[in-house]
Interface confidence: low
C-alpha cells in the first residue's frame, strides 16, 4: 500500500539503485517515486553532514522485502516511494529554495525582477529543467537579478551549493503550467534525427510518448513498430533531444512513428502510467513471481498491488492453466520496460498501474506548495482542492468555498446552506482560479446529496460542517485534486505553516474577489481564542487562526473553504472556514471547524453502498 511517513534522523542502509543531488527530501521522494526500481530513499540535508560531496545527497534504494535496516544519522530524512499512492503522485515541484545554488549547464542568462519571473522563464523554455536567480542583494553587483536557466543529463542538479542571496527551483512544466503548448499529433512513417538520450522497448507509440514525457531529457521520439524491417529494432522507442528543442530533420520511413513529449502541454499531462492491455503479446523481463489468477485484469491488479512489479504477462497456454485460472507472470527490469516483446503468443501483457494518479479513493493529496483580507493572488494549481459553491437563482453568484476530498465528495460549512437547502440551485466549480473565467459553457458539478451534520443548528457556531456528494465523480488533474484529511483526533501535530484560501471579501464591507486569494495565518490556541470571544463557547471541535494585530483573515464568501497546513511536505485540511467577529479585526481570530474532530462522521457518511470507505486519512 501507500506509505507516506518520513523518518527523521534515519538513513536506510544498502539497496542503492541511484543517487543524485536534490534540494530537499520531498524532491528526493518524488525522484524515487518516478524511478522504476526505487522503493525507499534517504536524503542528507546540508546540515546533516560535513562531507561537501554528500551534502544534499539523495539516495534511491530498492529492496526485495520492501524494507531496509535503518541506521541513526542526525539530520538525515528517509521515507518511501509514493508508488501506489494515487493522486499524491506528481512530478510537479513548486518550491523555491533560498540560499541555495543548483548547478547544471547554464544555457541562458537574462535579467529579471523576481525569482517568480525566473521560474516562469524556465517553465516557458523547452530545455530548462531548473534555474538559479541572484537576488538584488547578491554580493556581486553585475550578477544581481540574473536568471540562469539550466539543464543536466539526469534532470537534477550536478551539484547543490549553499550560497547567500541566490534562490533556485525547478521548471513548472510537470505542473502543466508551461505556456509553450504541446504537439499532440503522432506522425506515421516518419523518423526523427538528432541525439538519442535513451532506448527502451514499448508495445506502441503511445507508451513511448508517455515515457518520453516523463524522461528528464526527452523532447521527441521515434518508435519502430513490430513490423519494422530489422527484427532487432522492432518495438524500439528512441527518446531524443536536440539543441534547438525540435528535430533538425525527419525522414519518411515506413513502420516508424514519431512524436513529441507532452511535458509542455498546458492544463493537462498524460498520467505517468500505461493502463492498456496488449492481447497476443508477451513481455519479457526478470521474474518476480508467478501466480494463478482468473483473468488478465486480475493479473494486472496483482501486479499493481505488488509494489516491485513493473509489468506482467498472463498466459493462456493450456499447460499454464488449471480450471479457470491461468499463470500470471509478474516481472520487472532495470528501466521499467520489457526486455523483450513477442507477438502472436497466447498471452496478454500490460503494465502495473502503481503510478496511475487516479489511483484509489484515498484522500491524501499531493505536495503542492484566501478574497481573504490581507491576502495575495494564488496561481494555477496552487490549491487544487479549492472549489467555488455558487447559487443559480435568477442570477448566479459565488456564496461559499469548499474542499474536494474525494472523486465525488466536497467538504464545506453547514451554514452555507442556511435558507438554501435545495440541491438543484447549487453549482460547484472546481479546477478554477478566476471567477471571471466562468461562462455558461464552463463545466460544473451538480449536487446529488447535501449531508449537514445532525447536531448543527442555524445561527449557532457548533458542528458547522457539511458534506456534498456530487452527481458524478470528478477526474483528478494538476488543477483539480483532493486535499488530505487529518488523522482522527489529531492533536499532537504542531502546524506552523497554515493557509486560508477563498474568493471572499477583501474587507468587511467589500465584495467577492475574482482571483482566488491566499493568506498565511498562524494557528491560535483554543485558550487564547476563548479569551478573545468571551460571549461564545470555543469548543475542542473548533480551531482558531489569526494575527494578534489583525489585518489578515478569512471573510464573507470564504466560508466553507479550507484552512490547510503543510507538515512533512504534505498538505492537510485542518479547518473549515466557519465564523469570526467581523474580518481581520485586532485580537479577533477566525474560527474554523476542526476537521480532525469529525473524522468518524466524515468516514461514516462517505461509506459507499458496498461498505468500502470512499476516502481514508494518511497512514
Amino acid at each position: 500500500g501507500c506509505l507516506t511517513q518520513l523518518y527523521e534522523n534515519a538513513f536506510f542502509r544498502g539497496g542503492d539503485v541511484a543517487s543524485m543531488y536534490t534540494p530537499n527530501a520531498q524532491y528526493c521522494q518524488m525522484r524515487c517515486t518516478f524511478h522504476p526500481r526505487c522503493l525507499l530513499f534517504s536524503f542528507l540535508p546540508a546540515s546533516s553532514i560535513n562531507d561537501m560531496e554528500k551534502r544534499f545527497g539523495c539516495f534511491l534504494k530498492d529492496s526485495v522485502t520492501g524494507t531496509l535496516p535503518k541506521v541513526h544519522r542526525t539530520g538525515a530524512v528517509s521515507g518511501h516511494s509514493l508508488k501506489q499512492c494515487g493522486h499524491q503522485i506528481s512530478a510537479c515541484h513548486r518550491d523555491i529554495y533560498k540560499g541555495v545554488d543548483m548547478r547544471g549547464v547554464n544555457f541562458n542568462v537574462s535579467k529579471v525582477s523576481s525569482v517568480e519571473e525566473c521560474q516562469k522563464r524556465c517553465t516557458s523554455n523547452i530545455r530548462c529543467q531548473f534555474f538559479s536567480y541572484a537576488t538584488q542583494t547578491f554580493h556581486k553587483a553585475e550578477y544581481r537579478n540574473n536568471c540562469l536557466l539550466k539543464y543536466s543529463p539526469g534532470g537534477t542538479p550536478t551539484a547543490i551549493k549553499v550560497l547567500s542571496n541566490v534562490e533556485s527551483g525547478f521548471s513548472l512544466k510537470p505542473c502543466a503550467l508551461s505556456e509553450i503548448g504541446c504537439h499532440m499529433n503522432i506522425f506515421q512513417h516518419l523518423a526523427f534525427s538528432d541525439v538519442d538520450v535513451a532506448r527502451v522497448l514499448t508495445p506502441d507509440a503511445f507508451v513511448c510518448r508517455t515515457i518520453c514525457t516523463y524522461h528528464p531529457n526527452c523532447l521527441f521520439f521515434t518508435f519502430y513498430t513490430n513490423v519494422w524491417k530489422i527484427e532487432s529494432q522492432r518495438n524500439v522507442c528512441l527518446l531524443k533531444t536536440s539543441e534547438s528543442g525540435t528535430p533538425s530533420s525527419s525522414t519518411p520511413q515506413e513502420n516508424t512513428i514519431s512524436g513529441y513529449s507532452l511535458l509542455t502541454c498546458k492544463r493537462t499531462l498524460p498520467e505517468p502510467c500505461h493502463s492498456k492491455i496488449y492481447p497476443g503479446v508477451d513481455f519479457g523481463g526478470e521474474e518476480l513471481n508467478v501466480t494463478f489468477v482468473k483473468g488478465v485484469n486480475v493479473c494486472q491488479e496483482t501486479c499493481t498491488k505488488m509494489i516491485r512489479c513493473q509489468f506482467f504477462t498472463y498466459s493462456l497456454l493450456p499447460e499454464d492453466c488449471k480450471e479457470e485460472k491461468c499463470k500470471c507472470f509478474l516481472r520487472l527490469s532495470m528501466d521499467g520496460s520489457p526486455t523483450r516483446i513477442a507477438y502472436g503468443t497466447q498471452g496478454s501483457s500490460g503494465y502495473s498501474l502503481r503510478l496511475c494518479n487516479t489511483g484509489d479513493n484515498s484522500v491524501c493529496t499531493t505536495k503542492t506548495s484566501t478574497r481573504i483580507v490581507g491576502g495575495t493572488n494564488s496561481s494555477w494549481g496552487e490549491w487544487p482542492w479549492q472549489v467555488s459553491l455558487q447559487v443559480k437563482l435568477t442570477a448566479q453568484r459565488h456564496l461559499c468555498g469548499g474542499s474536494l476530498i474525494g472523486h465525488q465528495w466536497v467538504l464545506t460549512a453547514a451554514h452555507c446552506f442556511d435558507g438554501l437547502p435545495l440541491q438543484d440551485v447549487w453549482r460547484i466549480y472546481s479546477g478554477i482560479l478566476n471567477l471571471s473565467d466562468i461562462t455558461k459553457d464552463t463545466p460544473f458539478s451538480q449536487i446529488k446529496e447535501i449531508i449537514i451534520h445532525q447536531n448543527y443548528k442555524v445561527s449557532e457556531g457548533n458542528h458547522d460542517i457539511a458534506l456534498i456528494k456530487l452527481q458524478a465523480p470528478l477526474n483528478y488533474t494538476e488543477f483539480q485534486k483532493p486535499i488530505c484529511l487529518p488523522s482522527k483526533g489529531d492533536t499532537s501535530t504542531i502546524y506552523t505553516n497554515c493557509w486560508v484560501t477563498g474568493w471572499g471579501f477583501s474587507k468587511e464591507k467589500g465584495e467577492i474577489q475574482n482571483i482566488l486569494q491566499k493568506v498565511n495565518i498562524p494557528l491560535v490556541t483554543n485558550e487564547e481564542c476563548q479569551k478573545r470571544y468571551q460571549d461564545y463557547k470555543i469548543t475542542q471541535r473548533m480551531v482558531c487562526a489569526g494575527y494578534k494585530e489583525g489585518g489578515k483573515d478569512a471573510c464573507k464568501g470564504d466560508s466553507g473553504g479550507p484552512l490547510v497546513c503543510k507538515h512533512n511536505g504534505m498538505w492537510r485540511l485542518v479547518g473549515i472556514t466557519s465564523w469570526g467577529e467581523g474580518c481581520a479585526r485586532r485580537e479577533q481570530p477566525g474560527v474554523y471547524t476542526k476537521v480532525a474532530e469529525y473524522m468518524d462522521w466524515i468516514l461514516e457518511k462517505t461509506q459507499s453502498s458496498d461498505g468500502k470507505a470512499q476516502m481514508q486519512s494518511p497512514a
Epitope: 499529433n185 506515421q188 530533420s249 519518411p252 515506413e254 513502420n255
Partner: antibody
C-alpha cells in the same frame, strides 16, 4: 472549428497546368501532415500525395510522380498542389485532407473538394 | 504498392439489418486500416481508425474488426439506419503511399 477550403480547380487542356490551394483554419496547421486525395467522376478515392509538417519529406502516387508537386506555406496556413502536364485521366475532384492526431489515424478532416477537368 | 480489395462492391439492405463489409490487403498491414463513409457530392468522413477504434462522434453501431494476420478486415453496421446508405471505403496507412479500396455501395432494398 477545423476547416479546409480548396480552390484553383477548373477546365484545362491536356498538357496544361493548374495550381490547387487548400486554406486551413481552426487548428495549428504547421503541426499536421497533409494529403491530397482525388476522385474521378463516378469512381473511388485515390491517394495522390503527402507532405509532412515542416514541409520536408513528400511522397507521390506512381500515377502523378514527376508531374505533380505538393508544397505548403505554414505562415499562410496553406497547402498547394502544382499540377503540370495534365492528362484526361487527371480529371477528378481533388480533396485536401488532414492526417489525424494519433498513431494509425486516418484522415480526420477533409475539404469540400475542387473539380479539375482536363479536356480539349 | 499495397492493394486493397473490398467486397462486395455493392449490397442492398433494409433499415435495421446487420451489414458487414470486408476489406483485404495484399500484404500484412498490422492494424494500419481506416474506414470512411461518403455520401454523393460530399467529402468522405472518417468512421474507424486503427482497424477498430471509433472516431469521435461516430455512432457505436459502426464496428471495425480485423484478423491477427493483418490482411483481413471488416466493417459491421449492427443495425442499419436511413442515414447509413452511402459508399464505404477502406484505406491502409501502413505504407507511406496510402491506398484505398474500390468502395462498397450500400443501397436501400
Amino acid at each position: 472549428e477545423v476547416q479546409l477550403l480548396e480552390s484553383g480547380g477548373g477546365l484545362v487542356q491536356p498538357g496544361g497546368s493548374l495550381r490547387l490551394s487548400c486554406a486551413a483554419s481552426g487548428f495549428t496547421f504547421s503541426w499536421y501532415t497533409m494529403h491530397w486525395v482525388r476522385q474521378a467522376p463516378g469512381k473511388g478515392l485515390e491517394w495522390v500525395s503527402v507532405i509532412y509538417p515542416s514541409g520536408g519529406p513528400t511522397s507521390y502516387a506512381d500515377s502523378v510522380k514527376g508531374r505533380f508537386t505538393i508544397s505548403r506555406d505554414n505562415s499562410k496556413n496553406t497547402l498547394y498542389l502544382q499540377m503540370n502536364s495534365l492528362r484526361a485521366e487527371d480529371t477528378a475532384t481533388y480533396y485536401c485532407a488532414r492526417d489525424g492526431s494519433g498513431s494509425y489515424l486516418g484522415f480526420d478532416y477533409w475539404g469540400q473538394g475542387t473539380l479539375v477537368t482536363v479536356s480539349s | 504498392d499495397i492493394q486493397m480489395t473490398q467486397s462486395p462492391s455493392s449490397l442492398s439492405a433494409s433499415v435495421g439489418d446487420r451489414v458487414t463489409i470486408t476489406c483485404r490487403a495484399s500484404q500484412s498491414i498490422a492494424t494500419y486500416l481506416n474506414w470512411y463513409q461518403q455520401k454523393p457530392g460530399r467529402a468522405p468522413k472518417l468512421l474507424i481508425y486503427a482497424a477498430s477504434s471509433l472516431q469521435s462522434g461516430v455512432p457505436s453501431r459502426f464496428v471495425g474488426g480485423g484478423s491477427g494476420s493483418g490482411t483481413h478486415f471488416t466493417l459491421t453496421i449492427s443495425s442499419l439506419q436511413p442515414e447509413d446508405f452511402a459508399t464505404y471505403y477502406c484505406q491502409q496507412s501502413y505504407s507511406t503511399r496510402e491506398t484505398f479500396g474500390q468502395g462498397t455501395k450500400v443501397e436501400i432494398k
